[in-house]
């Protein structure tokens, strides 16, 4: 049933008004990943801290088993940053037969899983070649955008190589979503 | 006291409703930094333009002395981009005894200061090794996420090296926050 | 006319309340670009998918001819990611007389056009030197911030080199805005 707002000369009909503090929201932070069996043909998913430090879930937005559960249909802003770190990549070695090498790379994907739909949907992808010479390297990939999500949708963050994720600080690697 | 929305067959109780245009918001833009005394063991904080050009503060969100002041408790989306530029970094020099060098790096931190709490809290960090060979370099670090902040909290942006911040254009380096 | 919220002992006046689901919003995704005549002294603008896949426009936010049209004055969060890919850049070749070369670069600009104002306004810029050795390269530039926009303003995304934009997947290159 539509809520109403009254004005002298006309009547505007809206969806029910609701307080902003009542909307589903979550900010998850990095934890050290434990080795797990990854699904074939899919980048491994990160698991997250959901209540300690800066992390929280509220207003029916729940975190379970690597997934954020969407409790209510609507438009959500979804974001993540993953900081990667590694040793010297080898992509700049001498090229055979003059051909450029396939570079090393790091990738983050925010994925939506809908139980009624067989294939996950990639919402956001950040992918970067890594070609560092003579040193260790570290760098973040940041993603964020708005999506129309349905009640029951599940969101996860997948990465190309879990062993390169910097898990040391909650401000370096994180994942969040909020209903607009 | 709770605000109420009336519907024919039931009554929903919410926190008081409020117009979105009434919420604390700020977008600050870069200005050239002047040499200052930095706090020991903390990256230096940037100061910002808060009213000229694209910059603004509104609805009791104030800027003073490098800090954004949070006027009301709630969940805020906080973001910043810092564009760095420098001359050739030295991290790719010949390595001694086959060991990788510690690379040059650039770092941005969005920090929360709570007067009643002795230590600042790092909300967001973007950190990147810089290993450029034979050229000038420039690149942005972008950060953004949602945090539960309290009235009286103060936010600032700290950087690893103030002298490498690109101060030339308001669209390259900026800092903002808004109540959700 | 101002909407009112009544409380027992005082009266607070707000701008009219409105349901969040009724606000202008858009998320546009990459399509393959067709060669066009670019404006002199301005980076070329990308055109976008606005209804297929993850893309949508709603609540009077329309997309037409490379522009997002702002249907209502207010504060908007505006974001974009562009993923670039290319072959080896030449910026790290042997330097003449020991001087650093001017590096290759990639740039994304989110631009506002106001019909009553002769010059476009650059809202956001992400610019990055590209200096990769011996391989293909790819990397994203992400931008996002809040701006006060006026009804009738138009937003576009300009890039330094259209031919380097990765148009293969809707999750890699995108552009969006929503009224706060």
């Amino acid at each position: 049933l539509k809520g109403q707002e009254f004005a002298p000369s006309h009547q505007q009909v809206y969806a029910p008004l609701r307080a902003d503090g009542d909307k589903p929201r979550a900010h998850l932070t990095v934890v050290r990943q434990t080795p797990t069996q990854h699904l074939k043909n899919q980048f491994p998913a990160l698991h997250w801290e959901h209540e300690l430090g800066l992390a929280f879930t509220k207003n029916r937005m729940n975190y379970t088993n690597k997934f954020l559960l969407i409790p209510e249909s609507g438009d959500y802003f979804v974001y993540s940053q993953v900081t990667f770190r590694g040793m010297t990549s080898e992509c700049s070695e001498i090229r055979q037969a003059g051909r450029p090498n396939k570079p090393d790379s790091i990738t983050v994907v925010i994925t939506k899983v809908t139980d009624s739909y067989p294939e996950p949907t990639q919402l956001l992808m950040g992918t970067k070649s890594v070609c560092e010479v003579g040193s260790n390297w570290f760098q973040p990939i940041y993603l964020g955008a708005m999506f129309s999500l349905q009640e029951g949708d599940k969101l996860m963050v997948n990465v190309s190589d879990i062993s390169l994720v910097d898990y040391t600080k909650e401000d370096k690697t994180f994942f969040g979503a909020f209903l607009l | 006291l709770k605000g109420q929305e009336f519907a024919p067959s039931h009554q929903q109780v919410y926190a008081p409703l409020r117009a979105d245009g009434d919420k604390p918001r700020a977008h600050l833009t870069v200005v050239r930094q002047t040499p200052t005394q930095h706090l020991k063991n903390q990256f230096p904080a940037l100061h910002w333009e808060h009213e000229l050009g694209l910059a603004f503060t509104k609805n009791r969100m104030n800027y003073t002395n490098k800090f954004l002041l949070i006027p009301e408790s709630g969940d805020y989306f906080v973001y910043s981009q810092v564009t760095f530029r420098g001359m050739t970094s030295e991290c790719s020099e010949i390595r001694q005894a086959g060991r990788p060098n510690k690379p040059d790096s650039i770092t941005v931190v969005i920090t929360k200061v709570t007067d009643s709490y002795p230590e600042p809290t790092q909300l967001l960090m973007g950190t990147k090794s810089v290993c450029e060979v034979g050229s000038n370099w420039f690149q942005p670090i972008y950060l953004g996420a949602m945090f539960s902040l309290q009235e009286g909290d103060k936010l600032m942006v700290n950087v690893s090296d103030i002298s490498l911040v690109d101060y030339t254009k308001e669209d390259k380096t900026f800092f903002g926050a808004f109540l959700l | 006319l101002k909407g009112q919220e009544f409380a027992p002992s005082h009266q607070q006046v707000y701008a009219p309340l409105r349901a969040d689901g009724d606000k202008p919003r858009a998320h546009l995704t990459v399509v393959r670009q067709t060669p066009t005549q670019h404006l002199k002294n301005q980076f070329p603008a990308l055109h976008w998918e606005h209804e297929l896949g993850l893309a949508f426009t709603k609540n009077r936010m329309n997309y037409t001819n490379k522009f997002l049209l702002i249907p209502e004055s207010g504060d908007y969060f505006v974001y974009s990611q562009v993923t670039f890919r290319g072959m080896t850049s030449e910026c790290s070749e042997i330097r003449q007389a020991g001087r650093p070369n001017k590096p290759d670069s990639i740039t994304v600009v989110i631009t506002k056009v106001t019909d009553s104002y002769p010059e476009p306004t650059q809202l956001l810029m992400g610019t990055k030197s590209v200096c990769e050795v011996g391989s293909n390269w790819f990397q994203p530039i992400y931008l996002g911030a809040m701006f006060s926009l006026q009804e009738g303003d138009k937003l576009m995304v300009n890039v330094s080199d259209i031919s380097l934009v990765d148009y293969t997947k809707e999750d890699k290159t995108f552009f969006g805005a929503f009224l706060l």
Epitope: - | T34, P35, Q37, H38, P44, Y167, T168, K169 | R99, K102
Partner: antibody, heavy 118, light 107 residues
Framework: EVQLVQSGAEVKKPGASVKVSCKAS????????MHWVRQAPGQGLEWMGW????????NYAQKFQGRVTMTRDTSISTAYMELSRLISDDTAVYYC???????????WGQGTMVTVSS | DIVMTQSPSSLSASVGDRVTITCRAS??????LNWYQQSPGKAPKILIY???RLQSGVPSRFSGSGSGTDFTLAISSLQPEDFATYYC?????????FGPGTKLEIK
């Protein structure tokens, strides 16, 4: 108050070396690049190079490469510029300068006059 | 090296006049252009940074414009203390280079 205070005037013979000091105060010395700029009598400004006081890294203009050495002592917040194999054309006022960014100069020393004469 | 040229090399004007000085770079330097004022016997003082942004504490009668290769310094209403030599300087690439200067004299 941010200040750069330079050493006093010098008179040198051709072929000799000169070392000018620049003591910084009022700001974090290691946080900002220190530049050296010279100005011959009645002439314009000429950038000689910089030192990054934090790392000690330097960047010299090609013209002075091999003749100039920039160093620093962080314990006393002082930068030094040494120019060797002096010739009469090196007669100039030598300024140290720093700024909030590495590419511009907000704060200047008072200048040190170096005269090269036989 | 990037070569900076300035014009005119000198000009005469009166208190209250509007004057402009131009600076040209031999290649694009984006917005990495600074303007300095130097009075006789003194160290230079920065006026404008980033081609168009006024340094804190500098009077608003000074303004800068331009990007790429062509830049302008304008003084809207000359004051007695403005009679000095003005230099542009590029910060895009090392070696940083200055223009040869423009001497502004009282008519």
């Amino acid at each position: 108050e941010v200040q750069l205070v330079q050493s006093g005037a010098e008179v040198k013979k051709p072929g000799a070396s000169v070392k000018v000091s620049c003591k910084a105060s009022g700001y974090t010395f290691t946080g900002y690049y220190m530049h050296w700029v010279r100005q011959a009598p009645g002439q314009g400004l000429e950038w000689m190079g910089w030192i990054n006081p934090k790392s000690g890294g330097t960047n010299y203009a090609q013209k002075f490469q091999g003749r100039v050495t920039m160093t620093r002592d962080t314990s006393i917040s002082t930068a030094y510029m040494e120019l060797s194999r002096l010739i009469s054309d090196d007669t100039a006022v030598y300024y140290c300068a720093t700024g909030g960014s590495f590419d511009a100069f907000d704060v200047w020393g008072q200048g040190t006059m170096v005269t090269v004469s036989s | 090296d990037i070569v900076m040229t300035q014009s005119p090399s000198s000009l005469s004007a009166s208190v209250g006049d509007r004057v402009t000085i131009t600076c040209r770079a031999s290649q694009s330097i984006s917005s990495y252009l600074n303007w300095y004022q130097q009075s006789p016997g003194k160290a230079p003082k920065i006026l404008i940074y980033g081609a168009s942004r006024l340094q804190s504490g500098v009077p608003s009668r000074f303004s800068g414009s331009g990007s790429g290769t062509d830049f302008t310094l304008a003084i809207s209403s000359l004051q007695p203390e403005d009679f000095a030599t003005y230099y542009c300087q590029q910060g895009d690439n090392t070696p940083f280079t200055f223009g040869p200067g423009t001497k502004l004299e009282i008519k």
